[in-house]
Structures are given as C-alpha cells and as structure tokens.
C-alpha cells in the first residue's frame, strides 16, 4: 500500500488546531464532508461531517469541533478548539463519494496535545489574531453510516480511507457544552 | 465575472492616513473570507489583513498591527483597510482580494504613496 | 513567521522548454501551499493551490507538487505568454508569508 504521510501538529490544552483540507472544487464542491479520528487497529471513526449537499461557508458544530466548507475555494477547515490532551490522536479529512470509498484529503494530521500554559491563547496561530468568536449558530450535520469491506490491517491507499459509525463523536464534548474561547489582541 | 474594483490610493505625507476601498460583485460577497496584499514597487507581494465573512476573525501582519482596520460591509458588498500612522514602508500598489488564507480573485490595484 | 525561500531568483528558459521552480519552507506547511504568475504591470493570478491542484481554468503545462517543506512548480512546455514573475505562498499559518519570486525570462 502507499505510505501516506502524517503532518505532525504540537499544541497544548486550551489552543486550537486549525487545519485547512483543500480539494478539487469542481469535482467535490458540494460533496459531504467528514473529520475522522483514526484509532490504532480500528476503522476511521467520523467525529463530524457536513451537510449533504455541503452548504457553502455554513458552519457545522459537533461538540468543540467546527467545519467550514468553503465551495469557492476548494477548501475545507476543519478547527477543534480548546484541545485537551485526550484529543491526541490521528486525524484526517475525507470526501464522502457514494457508492465508492470516501476520498482521503490532504495529509493526516498527527495531533499531539500537552499539559502547559500556551503562549497563543485560543488557537495554534500566532498573535496576528484580534478577533476570534465561535459562531453563534451552528448545526450539527448527520452522517453517513459507511462500513468498507476491506479490513485494517495496514495503511489505505493515499486516495481512500474507511469510515464506520460516527459513533466516537460523543468522546470529545456533548453537543450543548458551552464553548469558551478567549477574545484577544 | 469576479471583479474587485480598489479605491482611496493616493499621495499622503508620513503620519497620515487613507482608506482603501473594494467594490465586489460577480460572486457572493457574505459568503467569502477577504484580504488586502500590497506589493511595494519593484518588490514582491506580502498580505497584510484578512477578514471572515461575518468578522468574527480578523488577522494582520505585525507590521501593520495597531495603524491599519480592515473591515467590511455585507449589505453593499464592499471592504475597506483604514490606514492610519502611515509609513513611508507603507508605499505600495494595494491589492483587495477574494480569499483568506490563498486568493482566487485580485483586483487591478490602488498605489499609496507615502512621502513628504 | 514562515520564511518561504524561492529559487532560482531567475531562470532562463527558451520556448517550448521545461522549466521547473523551487519553494522551500522553514517549517512544514502540510500541502497548504499555492502558486501565483504575476506579468508585467497586472496584479496575480493563482495557479496552484493545495501544491498540485490546479486552480480553474489553468492549463495542464502547470503542474505543483512536494509538500512538507519542499515544493516544485513546473511548466511543462513553455509558452510565450508564460514569461512572468510567480510567487509560492503558504497558507498553513498566520501570517500568511509569500515567497520573493522566480522570474521567467526567455533564454
């Protein structure tokens, strides 16, 4: 199989990863997209995903992971705020391309989360940021129930990942907590 | 067609200040991030702010931090940067762009020239 | 701040030749990195995004690749009207950092 490459990301509790998945937008513009965790041995599980069709730059919230899709760029953000060190994990952005295997975007994201005081409050960018509120009204899209036939026992190729239940989205925060993220200067 | 369409460059002695302009039609203004990149003359690009649809994020380079405001206006479709504290480093060919973080879309430009 | 780091600064290339241009990054940017062509007296136009996707309506002479820190734009057969200035620009991170250009020349 392809090796796919991991793009490492070291943040600490209390920032936020941001991470930008570009796609080919004429092909996969208004195609559902998904944020998958990837537990060793496991299937990918899907955290969230957007609406289907995905709506253009309408944010989704699950818990205090927020996706933009936004068509006219080909590109898909993908933000988990106020990380803890539980959240550390492999990560990746696919496109959901019934009936064939979801396509896998970008590079997976190795996140790495530790205990300390960060020096940029609130998110993984630096101090540039003046403004930063999550938005008020988000949904919660529902996704799709994928299983794939093909068991795990090594990496997918680089333009395929699986996806089972999106059972694991309740382990990071339930969908009513209140998010706090600091506006700073 | 996208067009992005700058005004407000113009002659202004250091320690003044402008305000740049951008009229965007052909696309969905509300729905786009968007952002100024100045290239001083003979020099190359460098982005200076950017801006989210609704203005929950801003972002700017240190440069610029304090002395510029970007900001926007969904309802007639346009983006400003208020350029205060100008600098003769300031010069350059202003450019409003579609995007925030890479940019599709470049209008033709407005100069500001700082010079006493 | 992410230094992008262009070479060469010129490169001499005849018609019809393959010309191939360098970005370098001072840490990774992942694939979040895109090519611009800038001509003579008119603003940008960008080319690649996401390091080997073509922006529309680019022609497929222009291809991206690399990712991590290396990157490589490539202009298979060059065409008269391709003789510009182009820019790398990595996205992953603010502040949002170009790199000093490549100028095409003809040979």
């Known amino acids: 199989a392809t090796k796919l490459t991991e793009e490492k990301y070291e943040l600490k509790e209390g920032q936020t990863l941001d991470v930008k998945c570009d796609y080919t937008l004429e092909k996969f513009a208004s195609s559902q997209k998904a944020w998958q965790i990837i537990r060793d041995g496991e299937m990918p599980k899907t955290l969230a995903c957007t609406e289907r069709p995905s709506k253009n730059s309408h944010p989704v919230q699950v818990g205090r992971i927020i996706l933009e899709d936004y068509h006219d760029h080909g590109l898909l953000r993908v933000r988990m705020v106020n990380l803890q060190v539980e959240d550390s994990g492999l990560y990746q952005c696919v496109i959901y391309q019934p009936p064939k295997e979801p396509h896998m975007l970008f590079d997976r994201i190795r996140l790495v989360v530790t205990k300390g005081f960060s020096g940029t409050p609130g998110s993984n960018e630096n101090s540039t940021q003046n403004v930063y509120k999550i938005p008020p009204t988000t949904t919660k899209a529902l996704c799709p129930l994928y299983t794939s036939p093909r068991t795990v026992t090594q990496a997918p190729p680089k333009s395929t990942a699986d996806v089972s239940t999106p059972d694991s989205e309740i382990n990071l925060t339930n969908v009513t907590d209140i998010i706090r993220v600091p506006v700073f200067n | 067609e996208v067009q992005l369409v700058e005004s407000g460059g113009g002659l202004v002695q250091p320690g003044g200040s402008l305000r740049l302009s951008c009229a965007a039609s052909?696309?969905?203004?509300?729905?786009?991030?968007m952002s100024w990149v100045r290239q001083a003359p003979g020099k190359g690009l460098d982005w200076v702010a950017s801006i989210k649809q609704d203005a929950s994020e801003i972002y700017y380079v240190d440069a610029v931090k304090g002395r510029f405001t970007i900001s926007r206006d969904n309802a007639k479709n346009s983006l400003h940067l208020q350029m205060n504290s100008l600098r003769a480093e300031d010069t350059a060919v202003y450019y409003c762009?579609?995007?925030?973080?890479?940019?599709?879309?470049w209008g033709q430009g407005t100069l500001v020239t700082v010079s006493s | 701040e992410i230094v992008m780091t262009q070479s060469p600064a010129t490169l001499s290339v005849s018609p019809g030749e393959r010309a191939t241009l360098s970005c370098r990054a001072s840490?990774?940017?992942?694939?979040?990195l895109a090519w611009y062509q800038q001509k003579s007296g008119q603003a940008p136009r960008l080319l690649i995004y996401g390091a080997s996707i073509r922006a529309t309506g680019i022609p497929a002479r222009f291809s991206g690749s690399g990712s991590g820190t290396e990157f490589t734009l490539t202009i298979s057969s060059l065409q008269s009207e391709d003789f510009a200035v182009y820019y790398c620009q990595q996205y992953k991170n603010f502040p949002l950092t170009f790199g000093g250009g490549t100028k095409v020349e003809i040979k």
């Open positions: 840490q990774s940017v992942s694939s979040n």
């Open positions: 052909g696309f969905t203004f509300s729905s786009n991030w």
């Open positions: 762009v579609r995007g925030g973080w890479r940019f599709e879309s």
